[in-house]
């Protein structure tokens, strides 16, 4: 499988936003690339979001997706928003070179995203 690199650990911001770079080593001259973020918890794998883009064009996720991203060459900058403490886990970047043939697939080792819910502000009496 194709080599895919991603950071081992990322800490989400206090607003529940986590960003990381997913980089792949392309064996060929792909024009259409699909990027999928998977979340693995124990033996369960769920798809968080996915986007297909044409090389040189912008990465477009569905309107209701919790992910946004930009692409530059063989590098994709991914941002996941709306995260809460319960979403802490391993997020895996999967890259597929869809067109032209041959089809290549690569799976990153995963980024452990830690999410800490902000402490609620104490009520103040004025």
């Amino acid at each position: 499988a194709m080599h895919v690199a991603q950071p081992a650990v990322v800490l989400a911001s206090s607003r529940g936003i986590a960003s990381f770079v997913c980089e792949y080593a392309s064996p060929g001259k792909a024009t259409e690339v699909r990027v999928t973020v998977l979340r693995q918890a124990d033996s369960q794998v769920t798809e968080v979001c996915a986007a297909t883009y044409m090389m040189g064009n912008e990465l477009t996720f569905l309107d209701d997706s919790i992910c946004t991203g930009t692409s530059s060459g063989n590098q994709v900058n991914l941002t996941i928003q709306g995260l809460r403490a319960m979403d802490t886990g391993l997020y895996i970047c999967k890259v597929e070179l869809m067109y032209p043939p041959p089809y290549y697939l690569g799976i990153g080792n995963g980024t452990q995203i830690y999410v800490i819910d902000p402490e609620p502000c104490p009520d103040s009496d004025f």
């Epitope: 499988a1 064996p27 060929g28 033996s43 794998v45 597929e96 041959p102 290549y104 697939l105 799976i107």
Partner: antibody, heavy 115, light 108 residues
């Protein structure tokens, strides 16, 4: 039209050597990781070896059953992939297919190892 | 090594039937799975790649699904020309890129 044409098969005695060739056309050979897959008579498919391309430093991989005996190589200038098979055993008897990525398959060449 | 278990090993169904073949991996393979069709006396052909994508030139009655460890190939309406042996293959590193044992599909 994509074509992969294998050659070099035949009847060989155990312990001897054979070199298979696969000539590719109709696609960008240098973009492809090339594989050899074999199929023993009446049996299923078995992946044998893979050679990656220049961006992957022509890395090679082998199944445990052929490691140390078979060598895969490629010549991008001629769009050919080779499988050098040494110390052949009767259990290496099979149809050998060359594949480009796993998208394109040749018609196969038959190797029979028998005394 | 990751093992690929395919079932059934053979099946017989009527023309028009919905046919399902399963392939199970001994570990999570993240959709890194291909399906191949091999008609009698012919070379295998790529049928489904990346678990769900239909290869060029293959009829739309074929579909692939699954995730994690468990994958399925479905023929929505079996046709006489679908008589073949079907193989799954794990395409995730590290090697070996193991094939399932195959499923022989026949017409009743």
């Amino acid at each position: 039209e994509v074509q992969l044409v294998e050659s070099g098969g035949g009847l060989v005695q155990p312990g001897r050597s054979l070199r298979l060739s696969c000539t590719a056309s109709g696609f960008t050979f240098s973009d492809n990781w090339m594989n050899w897959v074999r199929q023993a008579p009446g049996k299923g498919l078995e992946w044998v070896a893979q050679i990656r391309n220049k961006p992957y430093n022509y890395e090679t991989y082998y199944s445990d059953s052929v490691k140390g005996r078979f060598t895969i190589s490629r010549d991008d200038s001629k769009s050919i992939v080779y499988l050098q098979m040494n110390s052949l055993k009767t259990e290496d008897t099979a149809v050998y297919y060359c594949t480009g990525g796993m998208d394109y398959w040749g018609q196969g060449t038959t190797v029979t190892v028998s005394s | 090594d990751i093992q690929m278990t395919q079932s059934p090993s053979s099946l017989s169904a009527s023309v028009g039937d919905r046919v399902t073949i399963t392939c199970g991996a001994s570990e999570i393979i993240y959709g890194a799975l291909n399906w191949y069709q091999q008609k009698p006396g012919k070379s295998p052909k790529l049928l489904i790649y990346g678990a769900t994508n239909l290869a060029d030139g293959m009829p739309s009655r074929f579909s692939g699904s699954g995730s994690g460890r468990d994958y399925t190939l479905t023929i929505s309406s079996l046709q006489p020309e679908d008589v073949a042996t079907y193989y799954c293959q794990k395409i995730l590193s590290p090697p070996p890129w193991t094939f399932g044992g195959g499923t022989k599909v026949e017409i009743k």
